[in-house]
Every structure is written in C-alpha cells, then in structure tokens.
Interface confidence: medium
C-alpha cells in the first residue's frame, strides 16, 4: 500500500489506469466493432478478492491475454496500439502494487468475458479512488 505521503500520486495513477481501462471497454463496445462477438468468446480469470492495491497482481497476470484479444480489434478503435496500451497499463500496475511485492493471486472459479473483466477492474479502481479521497 502507498505511504500516506504518496496518496495523491497513487490516486492520479489509479485515475490513469481507470481511463485506460475505460478506453479499452469503449473501444470494444463500439457498435462498429465487427470482432466483438469473437472477442467475447475469450475467457478471463477474475480475482477472488480485489480490495487492495496488491490485488492488482491479478490484473497484471491477465494483461498478456488482454493484449492478444485486443489485437483482434480494429486498431482505429484505440488511441494506441494494443502493445503500447498494455505496456502503459503494466507500468501503472507495477507502480501501484509495488514491483517488490510478492503476492500470490487467487482467482475465482468462474471465468469471465472481456467486458466483465474490464468492468470488474474499472469498479476496483473507482472503489480504491473513493477510499483515497
């Protein structure tokens, strides 16, 4: 968890992560996205518990599959190439959870679609931000 002296910086990072996740969600939910049906067939692991920054480990472990699914989408739906976007998200996740943190992620039994996955992590960001403000 961030020290009290870095709360604001942490909140900014969370807001950046939130924006990127929302941008992905908006991009794939775009009515012009012909690959949406195909994208929804991919399954993502959901965290059993996601209430602290260390739980971002579960998001980090799913970034590679997320990038692979995004490669299916038309690039014009996104401001960035999937590789750059995921790299950006990865850096923010590392800063937030701390690269020295060793946390074993526990996943829920049920898998989820990309839309459910993104909504879960968007909710996580919003929840942590609300506790920081």
């Amino acid at each position: 968890a961030p020290t009290s002296s870095s709360t604001k910086k942490t909140q900014l990072q969370l807001e950046h992560l939130l924006l990127d996740l929302q941008m992905i969600l908006n991009g794939i939910n775009n009515y012009k996205n012909p690959k949406l049906t195909r994208m929804l067939t991919f399954k993502f692991y959901m965290p059993k518990k996601a209430t602290e920054l260390k739980h971002l480990q579960c998001l980090e472990e799913e970034l590679k599959p997320l990038e692979e699914v995004l490669n299916l989408a038309q690039s014009k739906n996104f401001h960035l190439r999937p590789r750059d976007l995921i790299s950006n998200i990865n850096v923010i996740v590392l800063e937030l959870k701390g690269s020295e943190t060793t946390f074993m992620c526990e996943y829920a039994d049920e898998t989820a679609t990309i839309v459910e996955f993104l909504n879960r992590w968007i909710t996580f960001c919003q929840s942590i931000i609300s506790t920081l403000t």
Epitope: E15, H16, S87
Partner: antibody, heavy 126, light 112 residues
Framework: QVQLVESGGGVVQPGRSLRLSCAAS????????MYWVRQAPGKGLEWVAV????????YHGDSVKGRFTISRDNSKNTLYLQMNSLRAEDTAVYYC???????????????????WGQGTTVTVSS | DIVMTQSPLSLPVTPGEPASISCRSS???????????LDWFLQKPGQSPQPLIY???DRASGVPDRFSGSGSGTDFTLKISRVEAEDVGVYYC?????????FGGGTKVEIK
C-alpha cells in the same frame, strides 16, 4: 535504478545548432512524459519543453518556440532537444527530467517531474 | 502564463530551528480533480534539482518527514520542522498545472 544521462552540450557560436540527448535507463521510458529544463549561470530554473509519453503532444517555452524542438525515440530510450538559431541567452545547464506519473492523464495531465539528470552545459559565444 | 512568486529570497537558518518558505501563484493551481498542481524542489550546491513535495503536500520518495507542504489555490508553504545542515540550497516551487510550466525565483537557505 532510474538514471538520466544528458550529452551533446558544448561551446557553439550564435546562430548555430546543437542537439542534446538524454539516455534513459531503469524505467519503462515509453510510459512517461519527459522534460527539458535549463538553468542560466547564477539564475533560477526555466522550463524549456515537454513531450508526452507517446510523442503525441509537445510543448515548448515561449523563449525557445520556433527554434528548439523536443523529440523522443522510445525504441532507443532517448530524449532529444534540437536547438537551432542559438543565442547568447541560451547559455545554460540543460537538464532532462522524467515525468512523475506514468500513463496518459489526458484531461488532467500532471506536469510533475521526479528524476533529473546531471545536466549538460551549453555555452553560446562568439 | 502563471506567475510564481517565492519569498523570502534568502533565508538564514539555525540548525534545529524551523523554517518556512512561501510560494504564491497568479492563478489557482487547484485542479477539478481536487489536487493542487504545485511541486517543491531543492537544488543543493553543485547538484541537480531533486523533488521534495508533489501535488502540494505529497512527500517525494526518500524525503525526510521534517519537510511538509501545505496550502491550496494560490498560496502554498514549505515547512522544515527542524533544519539540518544538509538542507542548505535553493528551494523552488513550480506549477505543474499547465504549459508553460513556471518556477518561482527560488529561496536560498543557508546556515547562520
């Protein structure tokens, strides 16, 4: 360990050009905004330019606008400052600095800096 | 452009005593996200500037807790609760809200 190393400074005549480089290591360069800040001898700090993490936005200070250009090569982890039409008042130590917060920021971009290089000296004199 | 005004210009201090530096901006640095986009830096003699405070009051990594930042809108203060010899140098405030980024003129802290 995050490190920024500037190079390319030196003595140059007025009206000539110079290109400064800043080699970055120890962090994911492509995810951070980068800055140039200068300090004239015995004076305070003056912001020169900023470039967003992906190069999509570049801003320059009024005193260098139209003469200096900030750029970056994310594949080489290097930041540049192309300085043309140099003047005596451009004489300064030039520092590159790393953005404090990763990511895009978009509507609420925070222009904070958390790591600075050691600086490279540019002297414009005839 | 946002003008940053620092005072005092010079601050002679006694080790162990508190010190305070003021920074005023020509327009509010309070962003709609609730943060004050105001940073403090220290430049020790012969060195590059180093960050002290982000966003008005967040201490940068490794900065001792004797340093604190406060204020909102246009008026900000950097406080050192007990000055140590290693704290000498020039302190700068900077607005990180919009380009052109602007710095205060600096406050030179020296031991009496």
């Amino acid at each position: 360990q995050v490190q920024l190393v500037e190079s390319g400074g030196g003595v140059v005549q007025p009206g000539r050009s110079l290109r400064l480089s800043c080699a970055a290591s120890g962090f994911t360069f492509s995810s951070y905004g980068m800055y140039w800040v200068r300090q004239a001898p015995g004076k305070g700090l003056e912001w020169v330019a900023v470039i967003w993490y992906d190069g999509s936005n570049k801003y320059h200070g009024d005193s260098v606008k139209g003469r200096f250009t900030i750029s970056r090569d994310n594949s080489k982890n290097t930041l540049y400052l192309q300085m043309n039409s140099l003047r005596a008042e451009d004489t300064a130590v030039y520092y590159c600095a790393k953005g404090a917060v990763a990511g895009t920021g978009r509507d609420y971009y925070y222009y904070g800096m958390d790591v600075w290089g050691q600086g490279t000296t540019v002297t414009v004199s005839s | 452009d946002i003008v940053m005004t620092q005072s005092p210009l010079s601050l002679p201090v006694t080790p162990g005593e508190p010190a305070s530096i003021s920074c005023r901006s020509s327009q509010s640095l309070l962003h709609s996200n609730g943060f004050n986009y105001l940073d403090w830096f220290l430049q020790k003699p012969g060195q590059s500037p180093q960050p002290l405070i982000y966003l008005g009051s967040d201490r940068a990594s490794g900065v001792p807790d004797r340093f604190s930042g406060s204020g909102s809108g246009t008026d900000f203060t950097l406080k050192i609760s007990r000055v140590e010899a290693e704290d000498v140098g020039v302190y700068y405030c900077m607005q990180a809200l919009q380009t052109p980024l602007t710095f205060g003129g600096g406050t030179k802290v020296e031991i009496k």
